[in-house]
């Protein structure tokens, strides 16, 4: 008796796909050992067709896959485009050789069934419409026409030309003739349901001179498309239900025992479990739409169905498309915080992972909005202008090679609470969802800037100080000038390593920035922040206004402005003559030709790439005192 288990007999027809699940005992060795699928030969040798080591035989090229699900102690073999040559005896098994633990599987692939010559076969999916063609001779042109359904020996009338319609086909069946045709009539049956399947006979005339045609109607449940996705990645369900339902409400539902629970529909319904991580996007006027779900969880695995009906709910006899989603827990996507908490007036630094192989991809951050079908307008990106309302308080810091970028949002308000997505123009699986929760602040912020009303005078020296608590003592402090393409850290150089101090005077922890001399282009937002290596922490922002010197304005002596720098050993001062090149860049709509749920962030095109790199001086010069 083998401890491996699976289906003993699998039967399908040519052109179809099979998905064979093999179950193995839940042990560490089994979870990680080689999985294989081989074909049993007459000589007793079992030839490997596919294995988890990456081997794929020539005859399976482009049509088969083997996926291990260690968390379920299963592996799945998918084989598409079946032919009768695939009929045979196989083994699914575990081990370094094909003689280890295995289970015998018999696969039988049949031809599509044939019917007698006078039988026309109609194959339709549930919810679709069939048009049955009925030919007759001229002698029956004026005779009664009918369609009946065989039930045993009897044939029960479905519809006839006297306007009789069987109650179970009411509003679904019509009998008609096209144009001037004198030898053919048609019966349309719409909103097909499984019980409509069977043998039909259409007839023109009565008695021995009647003309009869046989029609075999097969009504198929949609075969689910199998989707294999990693934990924390995203999935897109592409739904194409046809023109006939273009104007009906669309939905995506998840099969739950006997019902199909709507996750999202175009009438505004949305399952709370998918809040912040789902978008429904119409694709065209023909009823095509897509549903994107990010931040996949283990419990998202299951059977999904999209459909259309005026109610926005599943309805028997309406077209559907089906998927089975598998969520693999062995994910390449790192676990990142799904909830980030901030306080009003404070800041948050959100780390967004991306595929490390795509470090040159464009990075974006968008705000998920619940209205209608959900949308996610881009707020900031490596080539996108910061959206209105976020100027001076939002920046994206790319960290090439680290597999992550950081988005910092400061001057938080409770209106900033909500869901945000990290995404790139590269690997679409690497989309992460973050919920930002902003609470009312109950204490003073950790970083405070003085003076708070910052107005600098052209030609003079201007110093601004940032007070930080002792807990930031060992962290790197920085000032940066915010612009539409990031916050460029003002250059500085340490004059010798600072002496570590056993005691920390809370009042004297200051990092200062000096503009000397002030120029008109120095006007703008400045951030004071702390970081450790590439890990960004708290920030605070201040707007520095620049004005011409008026006759009565006091002249500040540069030495006085920096006097505190000599008195406070813990203070770091940065002096900068800031030259900012404001590279205003845009999100190119072509990047998302297929992903229109991400809203375009601006309306100017920009060729040169804006850099949001922490530490890039962007043409600034200055020195640290």
């Amino acid at each position: 008796q083998s401890p491996i288990f699976g289906p003993q007999d699998v039967s399908s027809i040519e052109g179809n796909s099979v998905s064979i699940t093999c179950y193995y005992p839940d042990t560490s060795v089994n979870r990680h050992t080689r999985k294989y699928w081989c074909r049993q030969g007459a000589n007793g040798y079992c030839a490997t067709l596919i294995s988890s080591n990456g081997y794929l035989s020539k005859e399976y090229s482009g049509r088969a896959s083997l996926i291990n699900f260690p968390e379920n102690s299963t592996f799945v073999i998918n084989i598409a485009h079946l032919t009768q040559e695939d009929t045979g005896s196989y083994k699914c098994g575990l081990g370094t050789t094909n003689r280890g633990l295995f289970f015998d599987v018999s696969l039988e692939v049949s031809q599509v069934p044939e019917f007698p010559n006078d039988t026309h076969v109609y194959t339709k999916d549930i919810g679709r419409t069939v048009t049955i063609e009925c030919r007759f001779k001229e002698g029956n042109a004026h005779s009664k026409k009918s369609l009946c359904k065989k039930r045993g020996e009897a044939c029960e009338v479905v519809i006839d030309s006297t306007e009789y319609v069987d109650p179970s086909y009411k509003d679904r069946a019509i009998l008609f003739m096209k144009g001037t045709s004198r030898d053919i009539f048609y019966v349309n049956i719409s909103h097909l349901i499984p019980s409509d399947a069977g043998l039909y006979v259409c007839q023109a005339g009565e008695g021995p001179s009647a003309d009869k045609n046989n029609a075999d109607l097969q009504v198929l449940e949609p075969e689910p498309e199998l989707l294999y996705k990693d934990l924390r990645s995203s999935v897109t369900f592409e739904c194409d239900l046809g023109r006939e339902v273009a104007n009906d409400a669309k939905y995506l539902c998840r099969k739950n025992k006997e019902t199909c629970d709507v996750i999202i529909n175009t009438l505004g319904k949305r399952d709370p479990a998918f809040e912040g991580r789902i978008l429904l996007t119409p694709r065209d006027d023909n009823g095509r739409f897509s549903v994107l779900i990010t931040g996949l969880r283990k419990e998202d695995a299951g059977h999904y169905q999209c459909g259309a009906h005026s109610s926005g709910l599943p309805q028997e006899g309406w077209p559907v498309q089906a998927w089975q989603l598998f969520v693999n827990e062995e994910s390449t996507i790192p676990n990142s915080r799904s909830v980030v908490k901030g306080v009003t007036g404070g800041s948050v630094a959100i780390v967004c992972p991306y595929n490390p192989k795509e470090s040159s991809s464009l990075k974006y951050w968008c705000h998920w909005e619940a209205d209608e079908n959900g949308r996610c307008p881009v707020l900031v990106g490596t080539q996108a202008l910061v959206q209105e309302g976020y100027e001076g308080r939002l920046a994206l810091f790319d960290q090439p090679g680290s597999g992550a970028y950081t988005v910092i949002l400061n001057q938080l308000t409770t209106q900033d609470s909500g869901f945000y997505w990290c995404l790139t123009d590269g690997d679409s699986r690497w989309r992460t969802t973050i919920e930002l929760q902003v609470a009312e602040a109950t204490k003073k912020p950790d970083l405070e800037v003085t003076p708070q009303n910052a107005t600098a005078v052209i030609g003079e020296t201007f110093t601004i100080s940032c007070h930080y608590p002792c807990k930031f003592y060992s962290q790197e402090k920085y000032w940066c000038k915010w612009s539409n393409d990031g916050c460029h850290i003002l250059p500085s150089h340490d004059e010798g390593a600072r002496q570590s101090s056993v005691s920390c005077d809370q009042s004297s922890q200051i990092v200062s920035m000096t503009l000397n001399p002030v120029k008109k282009e120095d006007e703008g937002w400045y951030w004071c922040g702390v970081k450790e290596g590439q890990v960004y922490g708290e920030t605070t922002a201040i707007y520095v206004a620049v004005e011409e010197r008026t006759r009565g304005s006091p002249h500040i002596n540069p030495t006085d402005a920096n006097a505190r720098a000599k008195d406070a050993p813990e203070e770091e001062a940065m002096e900068s003559s800031v030259r900012e090149d404001e590279n205003k860049a845009n999100l190119d709509p072509r990047l998302f030709a297929d992903e229109r749920e991400i809203q375009n962030a601006g309306d100017q095109a920009q060729e040169n790439r804006a850099s949001g790199n922490a530490g890039s001086a962007g043409g600034q010069s200055g020195s640290s005192k």
Epitope: S11, S12, V18, P222, E258
Partner: nanobody
Amino acid sequence: QVQLVESGGGLVQPGGSLRLSCVASGLPFSSSRMAWFAQAPGKEREFVAAIGWRGRTSYKYYADSVKGRFTVSGDNAKKTLDLQMKDLKPEDTALYFCAAHPNDDGDPRISGNYQYWGQGTQVTVSS
């Protein structure tokens, strides 16, 4: 109201044959998996055989103890399930239950993976 009704049980001599049938009515779906389980007196319900459907592909599963002796068949659209039992043994004596589930998902041997159940039909193998 969902009903699964089993029939075909009875008393049979060792080595004999029986055919069990199950008809499901009121199911809100064309069942994607149907199965037979057996419960001998004082024992747990045990998996016997199952059939799963995905589109026009069927998957048949058997317990080791019945392989080669029992054959499961069914019709997804008609919601029917049959079990042809040959070469019956005294240890096959049990109450046989029909079970149905909307998805061909999860381990078919686990009774918890089925939502609907019949009342059972008794099979007794004795000389």
